[in-house]
């Protein structure tokens, strides 16, 4: 039985040409996990493998890094980066785990006033 | 047109170790991922391992770890894999093969291949 | 590691025939399911990707349905240069893993 939940930043702002980081974390589960894939809508964005570490898509290869931990950083931001984006923890016993996070990029005087949560 | 050439067949000798090359041309070499694959004689296909040209970001099956090293040389467009401590078990056709564009997990293209035999 | 399970291991047909070949994954890999064509003493080459994206040149006879766990390739109408032997593979937990193959043989 799955047991586990995933927790997530979820909605987020950030500004144009910024960073953020976009985190997940997997709880009440002694499940291993054994990857975690992050994908925008259906794009594969990057790859935390146990055994093979981190892999990157060759499209987000300047823009995308690894971490912390198992999340991930995304960089010089756009506003074609608004959209959803989903953390994928495959795990053992269990099975897979998906958590959503919607990332809004605004325009820099937008997102100085903007009330939403954001992580600094 | 995308190619991937590879060097000639090898015999070697149970113990040793033995280095492939697959030159690439006709795209730009750091924007795809390379793989390796083989396939033992009338047998089907096991992946090996994966490098990134673009950093050399590396990362291997489990199965071969401390055994395959991949690497690649960005100046001449090539890709390498060292498989060490030979046994019979690795005779098999080794062929390296390109990621495709939209996930860097599928192969798009494939090099002709190279024959390993390991005989004593 | 997740074991795809290919089914038929062979199969005879005839020019024209429809044929359909099956990949069950041992757990879910969404649509992460590529096909490949190889003929004897030659390289693997890619058909379908993503489950049902046909890849460039691959003609339309080749056709890729399925998600989750269960994954069919179907040749519309089998044509003398389509015998050869096809895998299936996934690609959303590594380590990639590979069907171990249909040898479509002439009837």
């Known amino acids: 039985m799955m047991t586990g939940t995933i927790e997530t930043t979820g909605n987020i702002s950030a500004e144009k040409g910024g960073s953020i980081i976009l985190q997940c974390h997997l709880s009440s589960t002694t499940a291993q996990v054994t990857q975690v894939n992050w994908e925008q809508q259906d794009q594969l964005l990057a790859i935390c493998n146990a055994d093979l570490g981190w892999h990157i898509s060759p499209s987000f290869k300047d823009r995308v890094a690894p971490g912390p931990g198992l999340g991930l950083t995304l960089q010089s931001l756009t506003v074609n980066d608004t959209g959803e984006y989903f953390c994928i923890y495959h795990t053992y016993p269990d099975g897979t785990y998906t958590g959503r996070i919607f990332l809004e990029v605004l325009e820099s005087s937008v997102a100085e006033h903007g009330a939403r949560f954001q992580i600094p | 047109e995308v190619q991937l050439v590879q060097s000639g067949a090898e015999v070697k000798k149970p113990g040793a170790s033995v280095k492939v090359s697959c030159k690439a041309s006709?795209?730009?070499?750091?924007?795809?991922?390379m793989h390796w694959v083989r396939q033992a004689p009338g047998q089907g296909l096991e992946w090996m391992g994966l490098?990134?040209?673009?950093?050399?970001?590396?990362g291997y099956n489990r199965k071969f770890k401390g055994r395959v090293t991949m690497t690649r040389d960005t100046s001449t467009s090539t890709v390498y894999m060292e498989l060490s401590s030979l046994r019979s078990e690795d005779t098999a056709v080794y062929y390296c093969?390109?990621?495709?564009?939209?996930?860097?997990?599928?192969?798009?293209?494939w090099g002709q291949g190279t024959l390993v035999t390991v005989s004593s | 590691d997740i074991v795809m399970t290919q089914s038929p291991s062979s199969l005879s047909a005839s020019v024209g025939d429809r044929v359909t070949i099956t990949c069950k994954a041992s757990?879910?890999?969404?649509?992460?399911v590529a096909w490949y064509q190889q003929k004897p003493g030659k390289s693997p080459k890619l058909l379908i990707y993503?489950?049902?994206n046909r890849y460039t040149g691959v003609p339309d006879r080749f056709s890729g349905s399925g998600s989750g766990t269960d994954f069919t390739l179907t040749i519309s109408s089998l044509q003398p240069e389509d015998f050869a032997t096809y895998f299936c593979?996934?690609?959303?937990?590594?380590?990639?893993?590979f069907g171990g193959g249909t040898k479509v043989e002439i009837k």
């Open positions: 006709g795209y730009t070499f750091t924007d795809y991922y």
């Open positions: 593979q996934q690609y959303t937990l590594y380590p990639l893993t």
């Open positions: 993503s489950a049902s």
């Open positions: 093969a390109r990621g495709g564009p939209s996930n860097w997990n599928y192969f798009d293209y």
């Open positions: 490098v990134y040209p673009y950093n050399d970001n590396t």
């Open positions: 757990q879910n890999v969404v649509t992460a």
